[in-house]
Interface confidence: medium
């Protein structure tokens, strides 16, 4: 069955190696982790402390400010992708405790593990929404004034969680639940029933849409964004600028991994050496994955600390100040600190 | 379509080694455990044990430890079974087997068509 | 090791009529997991042995629905509802629950 891939996302291939057998004394295989996994298991902990709470917070904090202030709108809809992703994480975390057993039945397979593609679409399509928001907000402010308001965010909003679900749709609709009966296990994967060709279609629709496209068009607009607001001198600042690298960086950065896996494994024969090492490395790569669900907070409370010179406010208040302050367009076609300031946010991994 | 094709049937003297091959097409044969099975002539079935193709991880039945080795080689995806000192008591039909799986899409368990050991002298 | 064993070890059966076989194990087969890895292959004369029912009572694929299996903990049961000549084998009684993997002695089903 070399199409079928077990574990998280989509990756990760089938292997039934490690096992929970009875009347077997404790060996390499049968009772102990791998170190990926071990690794996994501590990156995810991590993650889920940090992103529920982190997430929590930014939703709270942007909730109050959605209805009239468009950079809240985009802070709190990152943070609820980021939140919900962050739920299926117990359960990821209990499988790979298990040695990839999957006891939570065939409706958890297909919804939970695709959590993490969802949040992956979202975040580079909101993200793209944002970037163009920065951009027209730069180079179209008279527009701006016009037209951008709350409604147009929130439709965008709606725009990009639908196109992200669409994406979704292909991993939730292979994924199943299988079963061995010895050594005794369940697994939950993704099953392409032996079709190469569909198993490497998707790895590259995942690739090009979810990595290579935004990186391409994200890095051209931050360019230009950089280049206008680098040109005035109110605005030349190597920290806005550390801070915008690290808005669009840290998305590619962590899901660089598990990209350049996946598509490796697509095209690898599964007796290669090397597909049977990127294997071993899955739960690891998608734990990497994960830390953009918790990254966003971070970010912005570092942002915000940035801003205030020293962490003098409580939490809430930095992060209201740092994610819902509105962007102002000066007639002079420059923007003010704020905008600078917000623009530079990390509104999830780009 | 899966495939276990067994080597064929050996005669072989007391105290001499034998070894069959078991090549398997149509999965993906590093990932899976190979399972081997003894059926001595009017007999019941024997687990022998299995070997992990993708490193060579092996169990054994204990009471096989000794007498059978397992290896496997991926870049043929074939795997092998030698018993060695053999005695008349080896005589028997050897099974190789990738064991039951299911899944919402698939259920499958297949077995190799048998390679039969004859020790006489 | 768990012990399998089967009654009984032949079993003549007229075409049409139905027939039973039992299986028992020295222990639980109840996994940690909550299943059962009880299994039914059936051998005929000349061939590989080939799943009929796996986790006690579970059909396999292609399997005719005259075949069922039942039971819990160590009793489990093979029952075929009419014998048509193609079922003549062994039928052996196998466990994956624990390791080592055990099958029972086998019980020979012929037609009268």
């Known amino acids: 069955m070399n199409s079928f891939n077990y574990t998280t996302p989509d990756y990760g291939h089938y292997d039934d190696k490690d096992t929970l057998d009875l009347n077997t004394p404790v060996d390499k295989t049968s009772n102990t982790l791998r170190v990926p996994d071990i690794l996994a298991l501590v990156i995810f902990a991590v993650v889920f402390l940090v992103g529920v709470l982190g997430n929590a917070l930014v939703v709270w904090v942007t909730a109050f400010e959605a209805k009239r202030t468009i950079n809240a709108i985009w802070f709190l809809n990152l943070a609820v992708a980021d939140f919900l992703s962050c739920l299926a994480l117990p359960i990821l975390f209990t499988s790979i405790v298990q040695h990839h057993h999957w006891p939570f039945g065939g409706a958890a397979c297909s919804i939970l593990p695709s959590l993490i593609l969802l949040n992956m679409y979202a975040s580079i399509l909101l993200l793209a929404t944002i970037s163009a928001d920065r951009f027209l907000l730069v180079f179209k402010p008279i527009w701006c004034q016009n037209f951008r308001g709350a409604g147009l965010a929130w439709i965008a909003c709606a725009v990009a969680w639908g196109l992200a679900l669409l994406l979704t749709i292909p991993s939730f609709l292979y994924r199943v639940v299988r079963e061995e009966y010895f050594p005794p296990k369940v697994l939950c994967g993704v099953d392409y029933s032996h079709d190469k060709r569909r198993e490497r279609a998707v790895a590259i629709v995942r690739l090009v849409l979810g990595f290579l496209w935004p990186l391409l068009t994200l890095t051209i607009c931050y360019t230009f964004i950089l280049l206008r607001t680098w040109s005035r001198r109110a605005t030349r600042s190597t920290k806005t600028l550390k801070v915008v690298v690290a808005v669009v960086a840290s998305f590619f950065i962590f899901w660089l991994p598990y990209q350049v896996t996946g598509i490796m494994m697509s095209f690898l024969e599964p007796s290669s050496p090397t597909f049977l090492l990127l294997n071993k490395l899955d739960s690891l790569c998608v734990s990497f994955a994960y830390i953009n669900c918790c990254i966003n907070p971070i970010i912005y409370v570092v942002a915000g600390q940035g801003f205030q010179g020293r962490l003098r406010k409580s939490l809430p208040s930095l992060l209201r100040n740092v994610l819902t302050e509105e962007s102002v367009v000066r007639e002079s076609k420059s923007f003010t600190r704020s905008t600078v300031d917000t623009m530079a946010q990390k509104t999830q991994a780009v | 379509q899966v495939q276990l094709v067994q080597s064929g049937a050996e005669v072989k003297k007391p105290g001499a080694s034998v070894k069959v091959s078991c090549k398997a097409s149509?999965?993906?044969?590093?990932?899976?455990?190979m399972n081997w099975v003894k059926q001595a002539p009017g007999q019941g079935l024997e687990w022998i044990g299995r070997?992990?193709?993708?490193?060579?991880?092996?169990k054994y039945n204990g009471k096989f430890k000794g007498k059978a080795t397992m290896t496997a080689d991926t870049s043929t995806s074939t795997a092998y079974m030698e018993l060695s000192s053999l005695r008349s008591e080896d005589t028997a039909v050897y099974y190789c087997?990738?064991?039951?799986?299911?899944?919402?899409?698939?259920?499958?368990?297949?077995w190799g068509q048998g390679t039969l050991v004859t020790v006489s002298s | 090791d768990v012990v399998m064993t089967q009654s009984p070890l032949s079993l003549p059966v007229t075409l049409g009529e139905p027939a039973s076989i039992s299986c028992r194990s020295s222990?639980?087969?109840?996994?940690?997991?909550?299943?059962?890895?009880l299994h039914w292959y059936l051998q005929k004369p000349g061939q590989s042995p080939q799943l009929l029912i796996y986790?006690?009572?579970n059909r396999f694929s292609g399997v005719p629905d005259r075949f069922s299996g039942s039971g819990s903990g160590t009793d489990f049961t093979l029952k075929i509802s009419r014998v048509e000549a193609e079922d003549v084998g062994v039928y052996f009684c196998?466990?994956?629950?624990?390791?080592?993997?055990?099958f029972g002695q086998g019980t020979k089903l012929e037609i009268k």
């Open positions: 986790k006690v009572s």
């Open positions: 087997a990738r064991f039951l799986l299911i899944s919402t899409v698939t259920a499958v368990d297949y």
């Open positions: 196998s466990q994956s629950t624990l390791v080592p993997l055990t």
């Open positions: 149509g999965y993906a044969f590093s990932n899976s455990w």
């Open positions: 222990q639980s087969l109840v996994h940690s997991n909550g299943n059962t890895y």
């Open positions: 070997i992990y193709p993708g490193d060579g991880d092996t």
